[in-house]
Interface confidence: medium
């Protein structure tokens, strides 16, 4: 028998994929452990290997489909299973009534590129991906720059409160190497928490003209 | 085989309180959602709520805060615990479950049981 | 809530006749069901995802439809059949039932 604390936590992209973390104390680490998926109302089940990610938590990604069919609604509730194997048979480990659209986390938004960049701002685009047509304009946004010699973790949050997958950063310094960033969280469910962010975008604003102020 | 035995009916006074069971066979209530559905007399089906596989709940909002569903998993039961009753909760009490893994649509039925609110 | 209204509420017809029983949602619904209830029994699903037979169900009753319209057919009315059927929506919660159809024979 496996004791200790249990988290067992997951999040729907929106689409096709359910992600799940479980993390056990004092789990054995040889155990075979999966999720199983058994929605209320549909006519298919996933299941999905749990793989290490620490000395005590596993994870998973359940693929319910083609990454952007929309395998799941706000009625639906699928039940996830942890399953471990006990020598010849499986043991439940932990179970949750899982809301897809009250556990929401997207994928990074993608695509990013300089639409234009001039010395002291930058218009830059980029695009959501695999998101549910369900949420029609209801996604807002949050970015932020990195500038040289700061971390990402110093790097002021700014937020789009609506779905706006453009920004023009302002009051930038001539001839500087930038990074941008940006994540996106749909406004519905009481779990919804905020995509990973996306790739960096790098970019350097133009240099000043010689002979103007800057 | 699949069987749903509902009992607990009965007559109450308004305002009473009354706890249908459904005792389930041939499945484990921890691996499928069961439904509590209803039948006035002469008159059409109304779903009352449900207690999935996780033990999570969800209610029709005309009887949430009256009726609670609830479970005992080593007696392989379901509850429905239906408090300040009126008159026109008089009806038959069913509880269903749907059918095998992902089957919509609830394919086993209790043979119900009558609940009459009367002074 | 999801309101589901079926016509006729009642009808009757003869041994060997079509009968057709219409569902209208008050809004799109995706999955639709439909039971058969005789009197004084539990309801019986007859028809899941709006037009797949359940298990045992004679191929005479078939379902079609999409969107806020659906209909039922018993292709060839059989004495057994004199039963109030119900159609029902599992898009949205609360699940809403139609107020039934009852059939009965001439």
């Known amino acids: 028998a496996v004791n200790g604390t249990s988290r067992f936590t997951c999040f729907y992209n929106s689409r096709a994929n359910i992600s799940c973390v479980w993390s056990q104390d004092g789990a054995l680490q040889d155990t075979s452990c999966q999720v199983h998926a058994w929605p209320d109302r549909r006519r298919w089940n996933q299941t999905c290997e749990l793989l290490p990610v620490s000395q005590a938590s596993w994870a998973c990604n359940l693929i319910l489909g083609t990454p952007d069919s929309q395998k799941l609604t706000a009625v639906d509730i699928v039940t996830l299973r942890v399953m471990c194997r006990e020598g010849v048979r499986w043991r439940m480990m932990a179970i949750q009534d899982f809301k897809p659209f009250e556990n929401l986390r997207l994928m990074a938004p993608i695509s990013l590129q300089v639409v234009h960049v001039e010395t002291h701002r930058c218009n830059i685009s980029w695009k959501i991906s695999q998101a549910s047509h369900y949420f029609e304009r209801h996604l807002e946004f949050e970015a932020r720059t990195l500038s040289p010699g700061h971390t990402w973790e110093e790097a002021p949050l700014m937020t789009l409160k609506q779905k706006q997958e453009w920004i023009c950063l302002e009051t930038l310094t001539p001839d500087t190497q930038y990074e941008f960033q940006v994540r996106v969280k749909p406004l519905q469910g009481e779990f919804t928490t905020w995509s990973p962010w996306s790739q960096p975008l790098a970019f350097r604003t133009k240099p000043a003209a010689l002979g103007k102020d800057t | 085989e699949v069987q749903l035995l509902e009992s607990g009916g009965g007559l109450v006074q308004p305002g009473g309180s009354l706890r249908l069971s459904c005792a389930a066979s041939?499945?484990?209530?921890?691996?499928?959602?069961v439904h509590w559905i209803r039948q006035a007399p002469g008159k059409g089906l109304e779903w009352l709520g449900a207690i999935w596989s996780g033990g999570s709940t969800q209610y029709n909002a005309a009887v949430k805060g009256r009726f609670t569903i609830s479970r005992d998993n080593s007696k392989n039961t379901l509850y429905l615990q239906m408090n300040s009753l009126r008159a026109e909760d008089t009806a038959v009490y069913y509880c269903?479950?749907?059918?095998?893994?992902?089957?919509?649509?609830?394919?086993?039925w209790g043979q119900g049981t009558l609940v009459t609110v009367s002074s | 809530d999801i309101q589901m209204t079926q016509s006729p509420s009642s009808l009757s017809a003869s041994v060997g006749d079509r009968v057709t029983i219409t569902c209208q949602a008050s809004q799109s619904v995706s999955f639709l069901y439909w039971y058969q209830q005789r009197p004084g029994k539990a309801p019986r699903l007859l028809i899941y995802d709006t037009s797949n037979l359940a298990s045992g169900v004679p191929s005479r009753f078939s379902g079609s439809g999409s969107g806020t319209s659906y209909t039922f057919t018993i292709s060839s009315l059989q004495p057994e059949d004199i039963a109030t059927y119900y159609c029902?929506?599992?898009?949205?919660?609360?699940?809403?039932f139609g107020q039934g159809t009852k059939v009965e024979i001439k």
């Open positions: 041939g499945f484990s209530v921890t691996s499928y959602g």
């Open positions: 029902q929506q599992w898009s949205t919660y609360p699940l809403t």
């Open positions: 269903a479950r749907a059918g095998d893994a992902n089957y919509d649509g609830f394919a086993y």
